[in-house]
Every structure is written in structure tokens, then in C-alpha cells.
């Protein structure tokens, strides 16, 4: 309808006596601005006056002038939108309708409003979700249709008259739409809360009571349970009965079916609110409980655990490792099933005692091949002594122990001899698989840990072996001492330092670089004739006839070695020169005549010089003297001289004969 | 036989700690057990700790958890480290030898050949 005015307000507002009342308004004239307004309490039409007839409480007029009485009332609107009213305080008397008379220039509206006072503070409203179920957050709400800016106001919740931790949320609104206050609390129920009264309490700004509204919490939950135990420790022998029984502290709503449940598994036919165990077994050892259900769900109670107390069953041995190193670290473990647990242990390594070992583990820090064999154990608790378990073995590897290199031959071995070396050792973990041998030689190894050296050297001196599992273990070298004749003999010159001469003093050693074994005797040889037994063979005068091919040898008891042969060279003057005449002493003159200088010489002569019967030396310096022709003033005695390093030697006259011709003396 | 010179003994309040040593003349390890033991006044003497080459222990059960027996090879010495000590530990402390003849023949309660002439450890509460 067009010709309306258009208000907006909430219908109908709540509030008490002393408190206060904000009335939130909107509104649009059909024309123009406002030019008056009356508030009216309980209005009613005058149709004589055609005006409104009843109690003023609030006016302006057109000089805008407001009465000193009218304080309590206050429009705080405006002259076209805002129409919002505020009465402060408020009576009882108040309670009704309230008019707003709305006045423009050429049109009149009446606007009506209800206010409801009551005498005291009303209570809130507590809303609750449909269903509350345990654990699950729920929003508990409290709703009050009031809120004035002139009266603050405070809801608190209280849960069995206490005040609940749990923050609360407030909201106010002051709206055209609404007006209320409102507090929510987020809160998530135990099944404990069942049946417990929620409070909802209005206070004033000084937290003084004003009004309440109260609930009662119906929490769903599961069924909650106790369990209880003969005997109350739950530590039973075997043999010994045992009683739980199951009961029901709180159900919402009733329970429907029982069982009991061990280790989490359900026992078969136990659907009683009591369970009894009787001569029970260790295998009955375990964590028991009850679970009853409803529509909720089921409920569980605390677990029980049933201890079925026995003597140590056999026990069995751990260990940390087996195979071990030698050196390394190893531990024992002892196990044995015991309820209580064993408080004593006794160890055995194979079958024997381990003195003063009586804890649940054995720690061997370094390892030692004796350590090896069977280990059992004993466990003891209250109830008794278990029995010996079948043991464990412990295997100790190590390298090859106390390697030795043997020699089968006979002693004493000799350059050439075949020997025959074995690689021995004491002990062995896992088993020696193969053997090393120092030095390497292409010796042959006839069988394992056996080597054979054909044609032995005389300087093999030293062999190790090494007996090999996963690791190697050599031996101490051991000395083949092999005997030999003497080595490397030779011919040394001690003295002269330098070349020999005829009259010399000589010394010739006789050297060898070595001999096992080292007696020796010496034998020194010329031509195959012997000249002597000592290491020196000494010449006090040296002479020509001394020269020539010398030799020495060394022997010991296994052999004898000769030196080469080494040429003793004298040096001497030329020495029994003689002239030898060719073709002979007498020759025919015209033929041809040859005198020869013969001599001994060391060095061979180098320079020869003649002479004639007149001891004239003659124009000729070779060894051969040629006279051709010749001629019967040849004839005469000759002698010749011959010169080396050493000196010079004469020879003793030679006479040459030259008889004439047959033409010579047939001419005379 | 070897001879063996106890050190590190004296006198400490209850709760507190003491390290003795046990210097041997000649080189142990890997041929001999070696231990500990003490005699207070009036009393026999008792084992207290062993170890043997191997590094096994075994330890009196009144000592257990608090005393401790190790071996310095190089130092050619034994130790006993005593923490939590009580008056009832008051004692002479004694080092003790023997041949290491058979693996697990190491214990307190063994017959030892060579002896230490002893260190006086006292406790006062």
C-alpha cells in the first residue's frame, strides 16, 4: 500500500522494573521531513476529536522544545529515517503499547510498538542440542530476549552450582530486527555429567543475582564398569582359583549383553556379570576385562592382569654372535619363561660350573679360543629351580696357531740336494685351506702344507710358511744352512804391486768368497804338478822358469773348486842370445847370407843392434841380418845386442866363412 | 711369583669415591686372573672383583652396581673404582693373582696364589 508509512522494529520488547528499554526504529515518511512526534502509552482513537487520546510520554514540538518531565523518555531519531526511543528506567506501569505518532508536513502516521515489563528480572532460556552423547563437543545456549545500553547485564554458567571453567562466547543485539542477549558454551560432556544440573545465571554489572533458567544434562554413554578381583592382587599359583565380577557403575540408557575378554580376545560362554577361573594354568596369564553394551555402544572396564605364578621352564641360551672372532666381544643371554622373573642364574661351559656367574647375561669382552664349547643355564625364581636347557655352541675362529716351517731332510743339506719343507701348526679355526711361502720360487708343492726344492741353491738361506684360513699366521723363518763347496775361487797377485820381474819376491793368494762349512784346505798346482798347501804360495827370487799357468783349489767335506787357470808373466833382460847363420857358417861369396839374432827375452826384444870383429856396430837394427851378395870381406866374427823394457843382453861372437867361386879361382 | 703394590686407599665420607691401583712387576695380561679382595677387622676376608684376560668380570653382591674392576694392559695395572661407598666397605683392600689355567676359573670365590701387601680404605658416615 502505497500510502503507508514504512516502519521497521522489533515487535515486542521485554524488560523489568528498573532496568531499561532501547528501542531500535527505523522509518520513511510518504513525504517530506518529520515535523512532529508524540510518543503515547496505550493510544486509542478519539473518533469525535478525530485525534488520539492517552498518556503522553513523550513530545516535540515544532520549536523542538522538550518538557523537563520527559528526561525518562528519550527519541533519538531524526527527522526522516531514524525513530530509535530509549526509556530509562522502566516501570511496570510501562508494560502496553506504546504509539509513535508520526507527523509530516501534509500526511500522519501511527506506528505501534508492544512493551512487556515485568515485575522482576525474567529468567533466560537454556537451549540444548537434541541428543548429548559422551566425549562429543556440544553448544550449550542461553537466550535472553533483553539487552539496553543503559543496563549491562552478565550471563554466567554453573554446572551443579559451580561455575564452569570452560570460556563462554557472549553476543548482544540491539538490531530492528532483534534484540536479545545471548551466551554459548562449548562443552563436551563426560558421562559423569549425566543427570547433573546446568545453570544459567543472570547477574547485573556487579555480578548480584537477578534470574535463572536450569537444565538437566541426559548424557549418553557407553556402560561404565569396574572390575573386581579374588584375590585382589591378582597373583595367583597354578592350581589356584580365581573370581572376577563385572559391575555396572552407569549406563544411559540400560545395558543389553555381558562378555568378558582376555589379551582383547572374547572367552567363549562367559556372558555373567562374574567370571571364575578355576586351577588355572600360566597359559591363563593374561589381561582380562568385561564389556557391557547398550545403543551407545560397548563399555569396557579396567584391565586385570592375572598373573599365574610358575617355576622356570627350561631354560635356552642366546648368544651374541656365534661364529666370534677371537678378540672380539661376545654376551649370553639366559632364557628362560618365569613368573616372577628369575632372580638367580647358574651358567655352565660344557657341563661344567661357571663359578660366580649368576646374572641373566654373560659378557665376554675379548674372546679367546678357550672360550669355545656347549653353554647351558639354570634359571631359579620363589617357586623353584627350572631346568638345564640343551645349550648353546659357541664357535671361536681364529688365524692358525703356533705355525712352525719343518725340515724332513736329513741334516745337513747340500747345494743340490732335494728338501723337502712341511708347514705345521698347532690349531686351526675354521680349517687351514691353504699355505703361503716366503720367499716365492717356482718350487713345487706336492701336497698341502708340503714343499718340495729341487736342486737346493747355495744361497737359499731362510723359508717361512704360513698355515692360511681366513687369515695367514707365518711361521718364523727357519735356516736351511745348506752346505756348499767353496765359491768363487781365483788367483789373486799380493805382491809386487806391480809387473813382475826376474828376481822378484812373489806372493800369490789363493781367494774364495765363501764356504759352508768354512774349514778349507788349499792346494796350489802348476801344469798338474803340486806345489803347495797354503792359501799364499810365495817365490823369494822369482825367475823366468817360474812363469807359466798356476791354478789353486779350495776344498771343504762337501767338495772342491779350482780357480782358472792364471798365467804368472815374468819380466827379464834378453837373455842366451846367439847368432845363427842361414843357409850355414860357410857360404859362397855372391850368394846370399842370413845372420839371425836369437834371444830369451820378457819382453820380446825391441831393438837389436849388430857388431862386427872389430866390435864396430853395423848400420842394421833388425833381428835379421842379410848380406847378399856376399862377399869374401864378409868373412869375419859377428855378435849382436838386444834391448827391451827390462835392459839389454849381448851374444858371443859367431864367425861367418865366405870362400871364392869356382869363377874366382878359375879367373886366377 | 709376581709382586703386587697396592695405592689410591685412604679415608672418605660416605657416598663419596676412591680409585685404588694395583701396580704388577711383571706383564699380566693374557696369563694371569687378577682380583680384588678385603678383610675388615675381625672378619674373613672376602672377594670383592675379578677380571680375567678376556675382560669377564664377576663382582661380590654387595659391591654390584657400585664398584667397578678394570685392567690397564700397557700399564701393566689393575684398578677398582669404589662410588656409593659405606662404612661397611671399611676394609683393607688387597690385589691378588693367579694363573689363568681354564676359561671361567676367574671368580671371587678362586684360590689366589700371589698377594699385594694391602691398602686401607675407611668410610665414615
Known amino acids: 500500500d502505497s500510502s503507508k508509512w514504512v516502519f521497521e522494529h522489533p515487535e515486542t520488547l521485554y524488560a523489568w522494573e528498573g532496568a531499561c528499554v532501547w528501542i531500535p526504529c527505523t522509518y520513511r515518511a510518504l513525504d517530506g521531513d518529520l515535523e512532529s512526534f508524540i510518543l503515547f502509552h496505550n493510544p486509542e482513537y478519539n473518533k469525535n476529536t478525530s485525534k488520539f487520546d492517552g498518556t503522553r510520554l513523550y513530545e516535540s514540538t515544532k520549536d523542538g522544545k522538550v518538557p523537563s518531565e520527559q528526561k525518562r523518555v528519550q527519541f533519538l531519531g531524526d527527522k526522516n529515517k531514524n525513530c530509535t526511543l530509549s526509556i530509562h528506567p522502566v516501570h511496570l506501569n510501562d508494560s502496553g503499547q506504546l504509539g509513535l505518532r508520526m507527523e509530516s508536513k501534509t500526511e500522519k502516521w501511527m506506528e505501534r510498538i508492544h512493551l512487556n515489563v515485568s515485575e522482576r528480572p525474567f529468567p533466560p532460556h537454556i537451549q540444548l542440542p537434541p541428543e548429548i552423547q559422551e566425549s562429543q563437543e556440544v553448544t550449550l545456549t542461553c537466550l535472553l530476549n533483553f539487552s539496553c545500553y543503559g543496563y549491562p547485564i552478565q550471563l554466567q554458567w554453573l554446572l551443579e552450582g559451580v561455575p564452569m571453567r570452560q570460556a563462554a562466547v557472549t553476543s548482544t543485539s540491539l538490531t530492528i530486527k532483534s534484540v536479545f542477549t545471548r551466551s554459548e558454551l562449548k562443552f563436551s560432556p563426560q558421562w559423569s555429567h549425566h543427570g547433573k544440573i546446568v545453570t544459567c545465571q543472570l547477574q547485573d554489572a556487579d555480578g548480584k543475582f537477578l534470574s535463572n533458567d536450569t537444565v538437566q544434562l541426559n548424557v549418553k554413554h557407553t556402560p561404565k564398569l569396574e572390575i573386581k578381583v579374588t584375590p585382589s592382587d591378582a597373583i595367583v599359583r597354578e592350581g589356584d582359583s580365581v573370581t572376577m565380577t563385572c559391575e555396572v557403575s552407569s549406563s544411559n540408557p540400560e545395558y543389553t549383553t555381558v562378555s568378558w575378554l582376555k589379551d582383547g580376545t572374547s572367552l567363549k560362554k562367559q556372558n555373567t556379570f562374574t567370571l571364575n577361573l578355576r586351577e588355572v594354568t600360566k597359559d591363563q596369564s593374561g589381561k582380562y576385562c568385561c564389556q557391557v553394551s547398550n545403543d551407545v555402544g560397548p563399555g569396557r572396564s579396567e584391565e586385570v592382569f592375572l598373573q599365574v605364578q610358575y617355576a622356570p621352564e627350561p631354560s635356552t641360551v642366546q648368544i651374541l654372535h656365534s661364529p666370534a672372532v677371537e678378540g672380539s666381544q661376545v654376551e649370553f643371554l639366559c632364557m628362560s619363561l618365569a613368573n616372577p622373573l628369575p632372580t638367580n642364574y647358574t651358567w655352565y661351559h660344557n657341563g661344567k660350573e661357571m663359578q660366580g656367574r649368576t646374572e641373566e647375561k654373560v659378557h665376554i669382552p675379548k674372546i679367546l679360543p678357550w672360550h669355545a664349547g656347549t653353554y647351558s643355564c639354570v634359571a631359579e625364581n620363589i617357586l623353584g629351580t627350572g631346568q638345564r636347557g640343551p645349550g648353546a655352541e659357541l664357535d671361536v675362529q681364529y688365524p692358525p696357531k703356533k705355525v712352525t716351517t719343518v725340515i724332513q731332510n736329513p741334516m745337513p743339506i747340500r747345494e743340490g740336494d732335494t728338501v723337502t719343507l712341511s708347514c705345521n701348526y698347532n690349531s686351526s679355526n675354521p680349517s687351514v685351506t691353504r699355505y703361503e711361502w716366503k720367499p716365492h720360487g717356482a718350487w713345487e708343492e706336492p701336497s698341502l702344507g708340503v714343499l718340495k726344492i729341487q736342486n737346493v741353491g747355495w744361497d737359499n738361506t731362510t723359508i717361512a710358511c704360513a698355515a692360511c684360513n681366513s687369515w695367514c699366521s707365518w711361521a718364523s723363518p727357519v735356516a736351511l744352512n745348506v752346505q756348499y763347496a767353496p765359491r768363487d775361487v781365483r788367483v789373486r797377485k799380493i805382491k809386487p804391486l806391480s809387473e813382475i820381474h826376474s828376481g822378484n819376491s812373489v806372493s800369490l793368494q789363493c781367494d774364495f768368497s765363501s764356504s759352508h762349512p768354512k774349514e778349507v784346505q788349499f792346494f796350489w798346482e802348476k801344469n798338474g804338478r803340486l806345489l803347495g798347501k797354503e792359501s799364499q804360495l810365495n817365490f823369494d827370487s822369482i825367475s823366468p822358469e817360474d812363469a807359466g799357468s798356476y791354478s789353486c783349489w779350495v776344498n771343504n767335506s762337501i767338495g772342491q773348486t779350482a780357480s782358472k787357470a792364471w798365467t804368472l808373466e815374468v819380466l827379464y833382460a834378453p837373455r842366451r842370445l846367439r847368432v845363427s847363420m842361414s843357409p850355414g857358417d860357410q857360404v859362397m861369396e855372391g850368394k846370399s847370407a842370413t845372420l839371425t839374432c836369437e834371444s830369451d827375452a820378457n819382453p820380446p826384444v825391441s831393438h837389436y843392434t849388430w857388431f862386427d870383429w872389430n866390435n864396430q856396430s853395423l848400420p842394421y837394427h833388425s833381428q835379421k841380418l842379410r848380406l847378399e851378395p856376399v862377399k869374401v870381406q864378409h868373412s869375419g866374427a859377428y855378435w849382436c845386442q838386444g834391448t827391451n823394457s827390462v835392459g839389454k843382453g849381448r851374444s858371443p861372437l859367431s864367425t861367418l866363412t865366405v870362400y871364392y867361386s869356382p869363377e874366382t879361382i878359375g879367373r886366377r | 711369583q709376581i709382586q703386587l703394590v697396592e695405592s689410591g686407599g685412604g679415608s672418605v665420607q660416605s657416598g663419596g669415591s676412591l680409585r685404588l691401583s694395583c701396580k704388577a712387576s711383571v706383564y699380566t695380561w693374557g696369563t694371569y686372573c687378577m682380583g680384588w679382595f678385603r678383610q675388615a677387622p675381625g672378619k674373613e676376608r672376602e672377594g670383592v672383583a675379578t677380571?680375567?684376560?678376556?675382560?669377564?668380570?664377576t663382582y661380590a653382591n654387595s659391591v654390584k652396581g657400585r664398584f667397578t674392576i678394570s685392567d690397564d694392559n700397557a700399564q701393566n695395572t689393575l684398578y677398582l673404582q669404589m662410588n656409593s661407598l659405606r662404612p661397611e666397605d671399611t676394609a683393607m683392600y688387597y690385589c691378588?693373582?693367579?694363573?689363568?689355567?681354564?676359561?671361567?676359573?676367574?671368580?671371587?670365590?678362586?684360590?689366589?696364589?700371589?698377594w699385594g701387601q694391602g691398602t686401607q680404605v675407611t668410610v665414615s658416615s
Open positions: 677380571i680375567d684376560p678376556a675382560g669377564t668380570t
Open positions: 691378588a693373582a693367579r694363573a689363568y689355567d681354564a676359561p671361567w676359573a676367574c671368580w671371587t670365590g678362586a684360590v689366589f696364589r700371589d
